[in-house]
């Protein structure tokens, strides 16, 4: 079985002030069994942008239907984007576990940049 | 430069059979999916087939599926597609092309190559 | 199986107009799965627009693309003469990988 990878396949994104940001992301295999998340920022700093597990986010919709069998599209789009949502996104793979999940593998992140409104 | 080239088209009667060769260069042939797609003279596209990068999933349009085999060499960075009982209908140009991510068909195919010509005729 | 639609079939513009092209879905499918290319004769197609949404690298920004659900859209903002070609929308993810039956953009 070939190893999990985390694709973010862009660098950067670029968006305006108001609209939405999707930020794409994908494995490349099922296995380990475990769910993903997306931070800003790297380190034990780093903030919880969305918890595929558990968590209430309502900014944050999925692209795809997670709770799909053999789904590996892992994009979120965040609504209503300001210049504090600026930042390196990534998204992280955790290996199940117990009593917690234990982080796997991390996409090389993108980074979120914002525009000033359209006037 | 990344490119793609293909080969192994011709003339071939009803019933026969031909293989398709691309040819890859310019990136790490084994991390993508490569797919073949086709165009009848003067029709839209219809996509073939796919392969993962390892080659352990395929995937075919039931137009071909029991007929055609598709297959990749990562030694050689060469795919491949094996094409028995012809007929007619599989006319066509065909193009092979690259996964835009290691993803097998997540994005959409970021490189093609320029096609070769089947043509199945009595 | 799932079937692609594109319309309208020919879409008559001069440069510098403004073309909108649909591809409907005969359900719903992720955006994340939805791809648009340019196929200009004797050529092979080029990958335009990725996720729906996403330009593909080197592509200029009068190509965009947006949608959700069944209804997705490529609008080129003014038509260049280089833009005169076929349009293509494919949904990938899924076997098949199924391509709409193209829009040709022609000019007036």
């Known amino acids: 079985e070939d190893e999990l990878q985390v694709i973010q396949p862009e660098k950067s994104v670029s968006v305006a002030a108001g609209e939405s940001a999707t930020l794409r992301c994908a494995m490349t295999s099922l296995i380990p069994v475990g769910p993903i998340m997306w931070f800003r920022g790297a380190g034990a700093g780093r903030e919880l942008i969305y918890n595929q597990k558990e968590g209430h986010f309502p900014r944050v919709t999925t692209v795809s239907e997670l709770t799909k069998r053999n789904n590996l599209d892992f994009s979120i789009s965040i609504s209503n984007i300001t210049p504090a949502d600026a930042g390196t996104y990534y998204c992280v793979k955790f290996r199940k576990g117990s009593p917690d999940d234990v982080e796997f593998k991390s996409g090389a992140g993108t980074e979120l940049s914002v525009r000033a409104k359209p006037s | 430069e990344v490119q793609l080239l293909e080969s192994g088209g011709g003339l071939v009667q009803p019933g026969g059979s031909l293989r398709l060769s691309c040819a890859a260069s310019?990136?790490?042939?084994?991390?993508?999916?490569m797919s073949w797609v086709r165009q009848a003279p003067g029709k839209g596209l219809e996509w073939v087939s796919t392969?993962?990068?390892?080659?352990?999933?395929?995937y075919y349009a039931d137009s071909v599926k029991g007929r055609f085999t598709i297959s990749r060499d990562n030694s050689k960075n060469t795919l491949y597609l094996q094409m028995n009982s012809l007929r007619a209908e599989d006319t066509a140009v065909y193009y092979c092309?690259?996964?835009?991510?290691?993803?097998?068909?997540?994005?959409?195919?970021?490189?093609w190559g320029q096609g070769t010509t089947v043509t199945v005729s009595s | 199986e799932i079937v692609m639609t594109q319309s309208p079939g020919t879409l008559s513009l001069s440069p510098g107009e403004r073309a909108t092209l649909s591809c409907r879905a005969s359900?719903?499918?992720?955006?994340?799965?939805l791809a648009w290319y340019q196929q200009k004769p004797g050529q092979a197609p080029r990958l335009l627009i990725y996720?729906?949404?996403s330009r593909a690298t080197g592509i200029p920004d009068r190509f965009s693309g947006s949608g959700s659900g069944t209804d997705f859209t490529l609008t080129i903002s003014r038509l260049e003469p280089e833009d005169f070609a076929v349009y293509y929308c494919?949904?990938?993810?899924?076997?098949?990988?199924?391509f709409g039956g193209g829009t040709k953009v022609e000019i007036k």
């Open positions: 359900q719903s499918v992720s955006s994340s799965y």
């Open positions: 310019g990136f790490t042939f084994s991390s993508y999916a």
């Open positions: 996720g729906a949404s």
């Open positions: 494919q949904l990938l993810g899924s076997s098949p990988r199924t």
């Open positions: 392969i993962s990068g390892s080659g352990g999933s395929t």
């Open positions: 092309a690259k996964d835009f991510t290691e993803v097998v068909g997540w994005l959409g195919m970021d490189v």
